[in-house]
């Protein structure tokens, strides 16, 4: 039990996308504000989002410190104007959030193609590596750099005028497709992480069709 | 435990219609690729189509394009096979299969089978 | 469609054996092979995946290479349980294929 008007926070749920990580709760303040708190399993505590009434607080700077370490945090509760108040035991209340870990849980963001090229029956479709917040040696890590062939990229691949998905995949940025001569093509693709159990699949990205301005077109 | 459970199969006239089921336990469909799978009696396999249950996505054999539909149910976690204008040459059993959607796109984990028989 | 051409379409052995099957795709693809048991009615169950790799609780006496659009199967000493039929599959590109399947049957 805390002080009179605090009440714990609840809720707890871990938001991560492409290691973008926000730790969301509940309820709404009244009278009281927040303070998170987040450690590795070994490690000591931290303290984020300082007496904040928001009900959010975005720890990526904590988690991209190493994305394969397992994360736990807690959001305390205070009273309004009367921060340094605890509860009957001396301690303020706080409720704990599940286990996170990053690198198998952040959810995969939309891919982009980033470009397609025909050269005769060959298409060459690029997806865009999307730049994350993890850093080595200060710079930004690609999505790549960071899950290597852990992730891979499925194509779906249609003639304009058919409606069956052919598929194709890899563990690079690119693929290399055999593609009907005269016949313009559409692509969608879906970015995957074959070992994992949940949060396998990104969504699908914008469909890009051939005779669009991202594709080249060149006849040998 | 991962488990694909066919139903459905049967004795059906040829140009009539059936509804094969695979229910899967064990795992999220959506978060896989479901394939049918046929086996004539005492022929090899032959694969029949593929659904992405998270966004309907699919593609058949040519020998069944146009007759065959598969859909899935993701809040039942079940794929379908609807076949029509079935003909002798699609007696077989039929099997579903997961795609673990790796690189090399293994199959790795079947159902038993369900036994469709085309005969007048 | 690629081809997946596979021989012998049946063999004898004995267990203790060492059985090599092969299977020659049509085109390129890649490392995208697998290897299925199968044994009469029942599902076809995964031995082998990208080519050479031992799929779970797999016996090691089972091995797959590749060499180009060549892959092979192994079986270094066979065991009672392994009589069965073995089929390749290609999936590089749509539609997967198989290869039309290896009988072994005990000498």
């Known amino acids: 039990s805390g002080t009179t008007n605090t009440v714990a926070a609840y809720n707890l749920t871990w938001k991560s996308t492409n290691f973008k990580t926000i730790l969301e709760w509940e309820p709404k303040p009244v009278n009281q504000v927040y303070t998170v708190q987040i450690s590795t399993k070994s490690g000591d505590w931290k303290s984020k989002c300082f007496y904040t009434t928001d009900t959010e607080c975005d720890l990526t700077d904590e988690i991209v410190k190493d994305v394969k370490q397992t994360y736990l945090a807690r959001v305390f509760s205070y009273p309004a104007g009367n921060v340094e108040s605890t509860g009957s035991a001396g301690e303020p209340l706080y409720e704990n959030s599940p286990e996170f870990t990053p690198y198998l849980e952040t959810n995969l963001g939309q891919p982009t193609i980033q470009s397609f090229e025909q050269v005769g029956t060959k298409v060459n479709v690029t997806v865009e590596d999307e730049r994350t917040l993890v850093r080595r040696n200060n710079t930004f890590l690609s999505l790549r750099d960071v899950f290597g062939k852990d992730l891979i990229y499925t194509l779906y691949y249609w003639k304009s005028s058919s409606s069956g998905k052919k598929t194709a995949k890899t563990n690079t940025n690119e693929f290399l497709i055999d593609v009907d001569k005269g016949e313009n093509y559409c692509f969608s693709v879906q970015a995957v992480i074959p070992s994992r159990t949940v949060n396998r699949k990104s969504t699908d990205s914008p469909v890009e069709c051939m005779g669009q301005e991202k594709g080249e077109f060149r006849e040998i | 435990e991962v488990q694909l459970v066919e139903s459905g199969g049967g004795l059906v006239q040829p140009g009539g219609s059936l509804r094969l089921s695979c229910a899967a336990s064990?795992?999220?469909?959506?978060?896989?690729?479901i394939h049918w799978v046929r086996q004539a009696p005492g022929k090899g396999l032959e694969w029949v189509g593929y659904i992405d249950p998270s966004n309907g996505y699919t593609y058949y054999a040519d020998s069944v394009k146009g007759r065959f539909t598969i859909s899935a149910d993701t809040s039942k976690n079940t794929a379908y096979l609807q076949m029509n204008s079935l003909r002798a040459e699609d007696t077989a059993v039929y099997y579903c299969a997961r795609d673990v959607q790796s690189v090399s796109g293994e199959f790795d984990y079947w159902g038993q089978g369900t036994l469709v028989t085309v005969s007048s | 469609d690629i081809q997946m051409t596979q021989s012998p379409s049946s063999l004898s052995a004995s267990v203790g054996d060492r059985v090599t099957i092969t299977c020659r795709a049509s085109?390129?693809?890649?490392?995208?092979v697998a290897w299925y048991q199968q044994k009469p009615g029942k599902a076809p169950k995964l031995l082998i995946y990208?080519?050479?790799f031992l799929y779970s609780g797999v016996p090691s006496r089972f091995s797959g290479s590749r060499s180009g659009t060549d892959f092979t199967l192994t079986i270094s000493s066979l065991q009672p349980e392994d009589f069965a039929t073995y089929y390749c599959q290609q999936h590089y590109t749509t539609p997967p294929t198989f290869g039309q399947g290896t009988k072994v049957e005990i000498k």
């Open positions: 990208s080519a050479s």
């Open positions: 064990g795992f999220t469909i959506s978060y896989y690729i």
């Open positions: 085109q390129d693809v890649n490392t995208a």
